[in-house]
């Protein structure tokens, strides 16, 4: 399923970084989110549960990021124009099935009163 | 697993249209082929094999295209400069098992030349 | 088709070590939290313990804990279990499973552990 | 540790029977809105085979004959129409948290 463009503020600008938003449904319990800038992986977190219902949070890109129980938020420090780009949150539910992706996404706009360092 | 930008000719234009290319291994023999714009589903095409191997080709979001043993192409016409976007195969494998999830894209850049009507 | 094939089961003495592997195929074993499940001569079922994905986490069971050790290889997917000062209450069928995020949803046939002296 | 009980220890059926097993947990299982309650089949000689997961839902593969329900501490597993094929134990499981426990089984014999 692709939920196409994201219709929440995904994009949270603070001191010269982005906090890319990526919100999923309260009901999931098990997944995978990647955030994807252009069809690259730049960040990933995967939450599931073993048979005790011990939560493992694994990273293989790893970003700075912030896990709440409907949304991670990945942060992107010293913006630059270069990080003008689409970009998706592209989350894989396992729990509860049926496993399912879906993509959201949207442009981010780089302003010279969000790059981290301007030329005075 | 996404395999980013696509690492062979994605689009192959003529006559003011763009023929955009999805590849698939030729070992892959059920699957559903999503063509994205964006995030937005565009075009879509899934190829099914029931209990006597009857193949079924189904399409939801209906777009010209064609079929081979290892590649579904989607035909856009009358291009203008709104086309231009990240545009994204996403690939779901059904079979062989396991369910595994590819998107690749790339970029469409529209220059003068390639649209359908140029003014004279 | 996911594949689990124990190897490794045996005779025994109390108070001997065992060490049991579990071969995987056909998914992608790292992607999941395996487990070792029990089962004594015509008794039920009995949980022994778990791993998480990359082996970083285990659980065990208070029965086992201090004796037995999980651990895996996902270059090898393979996961194994240690067993150490093993009693005559561990004679069991062990079995090896994929914990398919909700359900152990893959089993393999068993391998006999038999503690006796 | 939670602990699971199940009843009848044993029951006699006969092909075409509604067949109902019983399942005690000793505290509820309900998180959100998933009972973490689970049912597994085993025939003579061979490993458990994945029945019903989170008290309802039944695994891929599994005929419709065979249904779960039930919330909190209290679950059933129903066999709509008892077929040989169903002979075995049933064992009822909770993974609510750590450690997962097993009920001590269900063994339907033929009649």
């Known amino acids: 399923e692709i939920n196409g463009s994201a219709n929440y503020e995904m994009f949270i600008f603070h001191n010269g970084g982005v906090q890319i938003l990526c919100k999923y449904p309260d009901i999931v319990q098990q997944f995978k989110m990647q955030l994807l800038k252009g069809g690259q992986i730049l960040c990933d977190l995967t939450k599931t549960k073993g048979s005790g219902n011990k939560v493992s949070i694994k990273s293989l890109k790893f970003c700075h990021s912030q896990l709440s129980n409907n949304s991670v938020s990945f942060f992107l420090y010293n913006l630059d124009r270069s990080h003008a780009n689409y970009y998706f949150c592209n989350l894989s539910i396992f729990d509860p099935p049926p496993f399912k992706v879906t993509l959201t996404g949207g442009y981010l706009h780089i302003y010279e009163s969000q790059l981290c360092c301007q030329l005075k | 697993e996404i395999n980013g930008s696509a690492n062979y000719e994605m689009f192959i234009f003529h006559n003011g249209g763009v023929q955009i290319l999805c590849k698939y291994p030729d070992i892959v023999q059920q699957f559903k082929m999503q063509l994205l714009k964006g995030g937005q589903i565009l075009c879509d095409l899934t190829k099914t094999k029931g209990s006597g191997n009857k193949v079924s080709i189904k399409s939801l979001k209906f777009c010209h295209s064609q079929l081979s043993n290892n590649s579904v192409s989607f035909f856009l016409y009358n291009l203008d400069r709104s086309h231009a976007n990240y545009y994204f195969c996403n690939l779901s494998i059904f079979d062989p098992p396991p369910f595994k999830v590819t998107l690749t894209g790339g970029y469409l850049h529209i220059y003068e030349s390639q649209l359908c009507c140029q003014l004279k | 088709e996911v594949q689990l094939v124990e190897s490794g089961g045996g005779l025994v003495k109390p108070g001997g070590s065992l060490k049991l592997s579990c071969a995987a195929s056909?998914?992608?074993?790292?992607?999941?939290?395996m487990d070792w499940v029990r089962q004594a001569p015509g008794k039920g079922l009995e949980w022994v313990g778990n791993?998480?994905?990359?082996?970083?986490?285990?659980e065990y069971s208070p029965f086992v804990k201090g004796r037995f050790t999980i651990s895996r290889d996902n270059v090898k997917n393979t996961l194994y279990l240690q067993m150490n000062s093993v009693k005559s209450e561990d004679t069991a069928t062990y079995y090896c499973?994929?914990?398919?995020?909700?359900?152990?949803?893959?089993w393999g046939q068993g391998t006999l552990v038999t503690v006796s002296s | 540790d939670i602990v699971m009980t199940q009843s009848p220890s044993s029951l006699a059926v006969s092909a075409g029977d509604r067949v109902t097993i019983n399942c005690k947990s000793s505290?509820?299982?309900?998180?959100?809105?998933?009972?973490?309650l689970t049912w597994y089949q085993q025939k003579t000689g061979q490993a458990p085979k994945l029945l019903i997961f989170y008290a309802s839902t039944r695994h891929t593969g599994v005929p419709d004959r065979f249904m779960g329900s039930g919330s909190g501490t209290d679950f059933t597993l129903t066999i709509n129409s008892f077929q040989t094929e169903d002979l075995g134990d049933y064992y009822c499981?909770?993974?609510?948290?750590?450690?997962?426990?097993f009920g001590p089984g269900t063994k339907l014999e033929l009649r």
């Open positions: 791993i998480d994905e990359d082996g970083s986490i285990a």
């Open positions: 056909g998914f992608t074993f790292s992607d999941y939290w």
């Open positions: 499973s994929r914990w398919g995020r909700f359900a152990f949803d893959s």
């Open positions: 499981h909770h993974h609510y948290n750590a450690p997962p426990t």
């Open positions: 505290q509820s299982l309900l998180s959100g809105s998933f009972n973490y």
